[in-house]
């Protein structure tokens, strides 16, 4: 009897199973009684990356320079091209199809996580006992100075911008 | 007990014609692809022709095609080749063949055609 | 079209000796080759499907390998009723093509 379904790797047509073209592969032509599916290569620019009934390969994804675009990772007949973001930049989605500057944590806010290819700067504001009074892409919050370890006062308390004052103790006699 | 049986050998002249006939037994006909396959005297051996299941798809080599055409009537559990314009190159022992999981899994014992004045 | 070439033609071997018979493609064809026997005024008898698969009521001694372009079939200890000829199929694309056979003979 014509089978109803087909195991994995194969797929029904004209009342019987085929075997799907493995990765890297697309199909010529469909299986007969007589013979297999017939598949061919993907050429050099192009993948497939399932077992698939495709009668085209896919185009590998094009790393477009004057959107900041790099290749990260060659694509393959079974892999697509991995993009990824110039020095400075980072992606504006998961599929990476174009890049945008990395933000810079300002005076008040260091940074949590630098920047990657595929991430923006995380910024997070300065806890007390911490400043930062610069616009900066990979400045952490620094800790305010300690004036007591310099034999010193606080003349002027520090903020999340400004680091503390020291100044002289002063001597009483 | 699967059976294949050919028929319809014999000499026939350039360009004649002869029909082949192949009964099939002991086994749900109409389930199975059937082949014809071909051996010249003392050669090896050479496909001719396919026929699905339900006989709606026919597969032939570019040497043949436009000259046989194969046939089947489920009914009666039997398959053809008609054979046209025949040449002395076609003199071969005709067999049929069962099309299991795409192999040719049961053969007849083959009937001879010999073409020549 | 593509081409099955069988090596050697003729294998001279005597009665429990191993016997190595080869049949390349022209082309890949994955595991799509069949391998059939053929005595004397007798039928084609399937031996060996899919390359490697055993077919039930033909002797364990009887195997076969390779993928893509290069296959082989092996006799472990040839008995006296294997002198005959040997057929590779392939049914990765039309039209069907055979091997041209390598016959196996007593030395």
């Known amino acids: 009897e014509p089978p109803t379904a087909c195991r994995e790797k194969q797929y029904l047509i004209n009342s019987q199973c085929c075997s799907l073209c493995q990765p890297g592969q697309k199909l010529v032509s469909d299986c007969t009684e007589f013979t297999e599916t017939e598949c061919l290569p993907c050429s050099e620019s192009e993948f497939l990356d399932t077992w698939n009934r495709e009668t085209r390969c896919h185009q590998h994804k094009y790393c477009d320079p004057n959107l900041g675009l790099q290749v990260q990772q060659k694509g393959t007949s079974e892999t697509d091209t991995i993009c990824t973001c110039e020095e400075g930049l980072h992606c504006t989605s998961e599929s990476c199809e174009s890049c945008v500057p990395h933000r810079s944590c300002l005076p008040g806010f260091g940074v949590k996580q630098i920047a990657t290819g595929v991430s923006d700067t995380i910024c997070e504001p300065c806890p007390v006992g911490f400043f930062s009074n610069v616009s900066s892409a990979f400045e952490k919050c620094r800790p305010w100075t300690s004036c007591e370890t310099k034999d010193l006062v606080v003349q002027q308390a520090g903020t999340n911008k400004t680091d503390v004052v020291c100044g002289p103790q002063d001597r009483q006699r | 007990e699967v059976q294949l049986v050919e028929s319809g050998g014999g000499l026939v002249k350039p360009g004649g014609s002869l029909r082949l006939s192949c009964a099939a037994s002991g086994f749900t006909f109409s389930n199975y692809g059937i082949s014809w396959v071909r051996q010249a005297p003392g050669k090896g051996l050479e496909w001719v022709a396919s026929?699905?299941?339900?006989?709606?798809?026919?597969y032939y080599p570019d040497n043949v095609k436009g000259r046989f055409t194969i046939s089947r009537d489920n009914a009666k559990n039997s398959l053809y080749l008609q054979m046209n314009s025949l040449r002395a190159e076609d003199t071969a022992v005709y067999y049929c063949?069962?099309?299991?999981?795409?192999?040719?899994?049961?053969w007849g014992q083959g009937t001879l055609v010999t073409v020549s004045s | 079209e593509i081409v099955l070439t069988q090596s050697p033609a003729t294998l001279s071997l005597s009665p429990g000796e191993r016997a190595t018979l080869s049949c390349r493609a022209s082309q890949t064809i994955n595991n799509n080759l069949h391998w059939y026997q053929q005595k004397p005024g007798q039928a084609p008898r399937l031996l060996i499907k899919y390359a490697s698969q055993s077919i039930s009521g033909i002797p364990a001694r009887f195997s076969g390998s390779g993928s893509g372009t290069d296959f082989t079939l092996t006799i472990s200890s040839l008995e006296p009723e294997d002198f005959a000829v040997y057929f590779c199929q392939q049914f990765s694309s039309w039209p069907l093509t055979f091997g041209g056979g390598t016959k196996v003979e007593i030395k």
């Open positions: 063949a069962r099309a299991g999981e795409k192999a040719m899994d049961y």
């Open positions: 026929i699905s299941s339900g006989g709606d798809n026919t």
